[in-house]
């Protein structure tokens, strides 16, 4: 549900990833959107401590920009999703090995990955930076 408001990011986890003074979308389906979204990122972020140095910065950028989406202010504040191309690059290039392991473990029910269940968008459902450049955010 895309009901929410735009606000400056005031958290800690995504400080180094999000642009300074970035306007992010805070989702009012949470009682305390700022805290809830920060907790989501924090939980998934911990999983990223074990991934490869190639994957980690790309995954962190994807994670922060997916949970704290850029916000387009207006009469109806609107979240701007990540472009599908960036999403694909993180999943299939930068984090290909990690992604395979995570998918496999999740399918076999070995663990419930916070990152997998809560924090990773389905790339094919995202707008393309080529066909609709203003509809999505470039990382």
């Amino acid at each position: 549900d895309n009901k929410g408001y735009c606000a400056q990011y005031r958290g800690e986890v995504c400080n180094a990833v999000l642009a300074k003074d970035a306007l992010v979308f805070l989702n009012t389906s949470y009682a305390d959107p700022e805290e809830a979204q920060e907790l989501l990122v924090h939980t998934a972020w911990n999983e990223l401590k074990v991934v490869s140095p190639v994957c980690r910065p790309a995954a962190e950028a994807l994670l922060c920009n997916h949970i704290f989406q850029e916000c387009s202010p207006g009469v109806v504040p609107t979240p701007i999703p990540i472009c599908r191309e960036y999403c694909l690059a993180v999943k299939e290039l930068f984090c290909a090995k990690e992604w395979l392991v995570m998918e496999e473990k999740t399918h076999r029910g070995l663990y419930r990955s916070e990152m997998h269940l809560l924090s990773v968008p389905e790339c094919s459902k995202l707008p393309s930076m080529h066909w609709d450049p203003t509809a999505c955010a470039r990382l």
Partner: antibody
Framework: QVQLVQSGAEVKKPGASVKVSCKAS????????MHWVRQAPGQGLEWMGI????????SYAQKFQGRVSMTSDTSTSTVSMELSSLRSEDTAIYYC??????????WGQGTLVTVSS | DIQMTQSPSAMSASVGDRVTITCRAS??????LAWFQQKPGKVPKRLIY???NLQSGVPSRFSGSGSGTEFTLTISSLQPEDFATYYC?????????FGQGTKLEIK
């Protein structure tokens, strides 16, 4: 595993049209864009265009605009590329390729199209 | 359209040599550039993605660098199996465009 299987070689006369197909398997067909790239004998790679199989949006290189048409059939997981008004310079190997720049790239085996009178 | 100019178009080198191939874009493409290797009669194979990242399974003697308009592919110590044609591809915007290729031959 991901596979892209292209249709067989074609010999065409100048002025005719050719339709090359590319059948995808081993992945969710509608989740990935498909590119068409060609290579004339002894020449380099040339990007022709792209199709989003989910919905059929296309983008073509200027050079082929008006002469090329890319289509997708989700029921058979097949994309096709039709090139019309063929001339001898269109003699080339035509490749379909999934996600050239951004995701895991996979290529078809190539289809040789010969244009000769 | 963005033009990609590759240089040299052909070069000869010996096994063990360090080889550098350059690709120039006619406008800023950030780091959205890939490098492909093609051997005669084979389909192209991607070596480098997003300018400087090594594709899984590609030997570490291959490396890529650059951003904006100037990019390089380096092979640190040429092996017999590296003699092939190399292409750069910009994927910053449609239409995607390839460089004209660099044919690497044995000296």
């Amino acid at each position: 595993q991901v596979q892209l299987v292209q249709s067989g070689a074609e010999v065409k006369k100048p002025g005719a049209s050719v339709k090359v197909s590319c059948k995808a398997s081993g992945y969710t067909f509608t989740s990935y864009y498909m590119h068409w790239v060609r290579q004339a004998p002894g020449q380099g790679l040339e990007w022709m265009g792209i199709i989003n199989p989910s919905g059929g949006s296309t983008s073509y290189a200027q050079k082929f605009q008006g002469r090329v048409s890319m289509t997708s059939d989700t029921s058979t997981s097949t994309v096709s590329m039709e090139l019309s008004s063929l001339r001898s310079e269109d003699t080339a190997i035509y490749y379909c390729a999934r996600e050239l720049g951004w995701g895991s790239d996979y290529w078809g085996q190539g289809t040789l199209v010969t244009v000769s009178s | 359209d963005i033009q990609m100019t590759q240089s040299p178009s052909a070069m000869s080198a010996s096994v063990g040599d360090r080889v550098t191939i350059t690709c120039r874009a006619s406008q800023d493409i950030r780091n959205y550039l890939a490098w492909f290797q093609q051997k005669p009669g084979k389909v192209p194979k991607r070596l480098i993605y997003i300018a400087s990242n090594l594709q899984s399974g590609v030997p570490s003697r291959f490396s890529g660098s650059g951003s904006g308009t100037e990019f390089t592919l380096t092979i640190s110590s040429l092996q017999p199996e590296d003699f092939a044609t190399y292409y750069c591809l910009q994927h910053n915007s449609y239409p995607y465009t390839f460089g004209q290729g660099t044919k690497l031959e044995i000296k």
